[in-house]
Interface confidence: medium
Amino acid sequence: YNNFRKSMDSIGKKQYQVQHGSCSYTFLLPEMDNCRSSSSPYVSNAVQRDAPLEYDDSVQRLQVLENIMENNTQWLMKLENYIQDNMKKEMVEIQQNAVQNQTAVMIEIGTNLLNQTAEQTRKLTDVEAQVLNQTTRLELQLLEHSLSTNKLEKQILDQTSEINKLQDKNSFLEKKVLAMEDKHIIQLQSIKEEKDQLQVLVSKQNSIIEELEKKIVTATVNNSVLQKQQHDLMETVNNLLTMMSTSNSAKDPTVAKEEQISFRDCAEVFKSGHTTNGIYTLTFPNSTEEIKAYCDMEAGGGGWTIIQRREDGSVDFQRTWKEYKVGFGNPSGEYWLGNEFVSQLTNQQRYVLKIHLKDWEGNEAYSLYEHFYLSSEELNYRIHLKGLTGTAGKISSISQPGNDFSTKDGDNDKCICKCSQMLTGGWWFDACGPSNLNGMYYPQRQNTNKFNGIKWYYWKGSGYSLKATTMMIRPADF
């Protein structure tokens, strides 16, 4: 066989022509349009991409590959069938018509064709393997892409909801800010009004103060005049008393005795027949030294010596050690009787202490101690109390055991701080303890949240400053 060539016919079939001597053999084979030639194989992207491929594009490519694979399979089957059919026919014809040497040629041609078929089959198997490989890779990629897509969708949804939340919050805050701005403007206006009112008040007060200062000057002048008159009167009274005692002593010796009687406390005054509330002159025990005190002859049977009173804030109780020792203030109003007198008195016999309290809401309460005395000045007038009863708290608001007395210039408390300076007034401070009846006097509506006010913790709590207080003593056997 001299010649073997391949060409295409008009209807697109592959044409195999074999020339052997005077005989020529032509085989017509079907050709698949979509079959990719081996010279241009499909090569996918070699590098993995971070960004997902277009989903539809991947699906299309996969479908194309599936179609190609299916077509190849069909083509292969057709080719096999076709060769088998033609071979059968050709072989019969050859056997009938051909001479012996042509039979040999035909066998050779058949062998060649079979070899070619085998080669084609192998190539198709390779293509099929490649397609499968590619399909698997694409499936994996698709899976990755769909996962990535889901993740992105979730993230987008989360971010969207977050944005919505932030927008809501933002609008809420904007409203709040606007409301605050409005409020601020209103407040500023009211503050300005208050300021104007205060300025008016201040100017009024200034003029009142000026008037008061003038009145004080006048009163001071009047006072000195009155004091001189009082002094003159006292001298006259003393002279009269002297004259009377001189003339009466001879006639009635008992009168002289009565005139010499002095009272140690208000209980003695009461027992002597004076049962009216008021200021009486008391005498220090074992001494001729005198002191003026207010006696309550009505409350709880009378005979009470008032040792402290607060009622209107008219007297400053932030005083020195010496002032608390000797006493200060006005016995008919706010005053402190004096630690020295009380100490001496309460060491003579057993005394009870009653503390009467009033709040700003019209309530009253008391604490009664069945035994009370003060130590001497050497022991800083330490307070000693026993047996508490009453309505102003079940626990004593004067710390037990008693503490030393402290003043602004005599720091004897149990604190590293200076309670008297901090809380103002002289008192039996602990550190600083639950009471201080000598604290700052605060008027109504300013009397709460004040830790330096007039305090009795176990009745009104820590920050409440009382309206009025009275401390009174009386012999236990009265």
Partner: antibody, heavy 123, light 112 residues
Amino acid sequence: QVQLVQSGAEVKKPGASVKVSCKASGYTFTSYAMHWVRQAPGQRLEWMGWINAGNGNTKYSQKFQGRVTITRDTSASTAYMELSGLRSEDTAVYYCARGVDDYGGNSWAFDIWGQGTMVTVSS
Amino acid sequence: DIVMTQSPLSLPVTPGEPASISCRSSQSLLHSNGYNYLDWYLQKPGQSPQLLIYLGSNRASGVPDRFTGSGSATDFTLRISRVEAEDVGVYYCMQALQTPLTFGGGTKVEIK
């Protein structure tokens, strides 16, 4: 004189509890609030809570809420601080301190301090 | 919680020279009763803290008058007019206005 004496150093394992005592003397124990403050190595002082020794009322820092318990025994004039669920970061010196106040627990200073108790938490 | 910020962190001083420590709070410590609820403590090496100044400007008993506390609302200062060797240690400010009571980070004063 007024003083606070604390119990000795402790070594504890994580998850355990520790109870530190603070004995008061020289003053009326029930008239004051007792505070507990701790100091981890190289750290600032940290307030843990307080007890009103008179009525037993307590207040704790939110940080220690649920883990700290402050109690007192008035007959022994002693305050106690118990910290549970110990962690390594609880390693610190624990102080008790007497509160100076307007009475009612609103302390405005700590005037007396204990000598401190070292608590080490280690596995 | 009220945050307390102290400066400087460290303060090298010369004996006899003045020294100043600053303390700032995240909100006003001025109480309605007129007092600033701020205290200063000194923790000497190996010791417990000790109270120096209470309620902004009140010197504790036994504290030398070379220590002065000043300031109001959110800004406070502790001044030592003439530093002495015994003044070394860590100084802490503490707010007592509301619980939890909180301390500053401390200022370490040491001799140069």
